[in-house]
C-alpha cells in the first residue's frame, strides 16, 4: 500500500525568500481528507516546516502563524514556502497523508532541495 | 490539527513496570492504526508494536512479546503500552505513531516522545 508522492527535485527561492513547488501524489483509493505536511530533513533529523488537512475540492488550510500557503487541484498540490533565508537552505519533503476514507495510506516525496541566497544590501547612494 | 502527546516516561529498575500513555487529537482516533515505536540512544528508530483501530488485532516485535502490552481507549482518543519486567536494554525514547507498522519511521506523524530510563 505504497503511495508514489513526486516533488521537483531542486528550486531556487526568489529574492523575496519565497519558494515554490508542486507535490503530486498517486492515490490508491478515492479519497475525501488529504493531509499535506512539509518536512525538512538535515542528515537524520526531521522537523515539521508546515501541515494543512483538506477535503477534496476544497482549499488546503495552513494555521494562521504558517509560513506556508498552497492550494490544490486534483492529486496535486502547489506549496508555496515563504520567509526563507539563506540558512533554510536544505531538503524539503512532501509528505501525503490520506486520511479518510480508510485504509490510511502515507507516502513520502524524494525531497526537494531550496536554495536561498540572501539579497545583498542596496549601497548607499549619497 | 494533528497531534500526539506521549507522557508516563520516567526512571524505572529492572524488572519495574511503566504506562505509556498517548492522547491524540485532531483526527478521528478510531478508524486509525496506531503504533508505538522507540529510539533508544545512539540507535536508530525501533517498531514495537501495532494495534488495529478496533483492537482486537495486535502486533509485537519479538524482543518485546509477553513484556509488552499495546492498547486503546477510542472513546478517549488514546493510546497505551504497559511495559512489564523492564530490561535495561529498554531504556528509549518512546514514540506513539499514526499507522500501521510499514509507516513507523523518522516521516511518521508521531509525537515528541517519552523517555524510559531503565537502570539500577
Known amino acids: 500500500k505504497a503511495m508514489h508522492v513526486a516533488q521537483p527535485a531542486v528550486v531556487l527561492a526568489n529574492s523575496r525568500g519565497t519558494a515554490s513547488f508542486v507535490c503530486e501524489y498517486a492515490s490508491p483509493g478515492k479519497a475525501t481528507e488529504v493531509r499535506v505536511t512539509v518536512l525538512r530533513q538535515a542528515d537524520s533529523q526531521v522537523t515539521e516546516v508546515c501541515a494543512a488537512t483538506y477535503m477534496m475540492g476544497n482549499e488546503l488550510t495552513f494555521l494562521d502563524d504558517s509560513i506556508c500557503t498552497g492550494t490544490s487541484s486534483g492529486n496535486q498540490v502547489n506549496l508555496t514556502i515563504q520567509g526563507l533565508r539563506a540558512m533554510d537552505t536544505g531538503l524539503y519533503i512532501c509528505k501525503v497523508e490520506l486520511m479518510y476514507p480508510p485504509p490510511y495510506y502515507m507516502g513520502i516525496g524524494n525531497g526537494t532541495q531550496i536554495y536561498v541566497i540572501d539579497p545583498e544590501p542596496c549601497p548607499d547612494s549619497d | 490539527e494533528v497531534q500526539l502527546v506521549e507522557s508516563g516516561g520516567g526512571l524505572v529498575q529492572p524488572g519495574g513496570s511503566l504506562r505509556l500513555s498517548c492522547a491524540v487529537s485532531g483526527l478521528n482516533f478510531g478508524i486509525y492504526d496506531f503504533t508505538w515505536g522507540r529510539q533508544a540512544p545512539g540507535k536508530g528508530l525501533e517498531w514495537i508494536a501495532t494495534m488495529n483501530p478496533d483492537g482486537d488485532i495486535t502486533n509485537y516485535v519479538d524482543s518485546v512479546k509477553g513484556r509488552f502490552t499495546i492498547s486503546r481507549d477510542n472513546a478517549n482518543e488514546s493510546l497505551y503500552l504497559q511495559m512489564n519486567s523492564l530490561k535495561p536494554e529498554d531504556t528509549a525514547l518512546y514514540y506513539c505513531?499514526?499507522?500501521?507498522?510499514?509507516?513507523?519511521?523518522?516521516?511518521?506523524?508521531r509525537g515528541q516522545g517519552t523517555l524510559v530510563t531503565v537502570s539500577s
Open positions: 505513531a499514526l499507522g500501521p507498522e510499514r509507516y513507523f519511521s523518522i516521516y511518521a506523524t
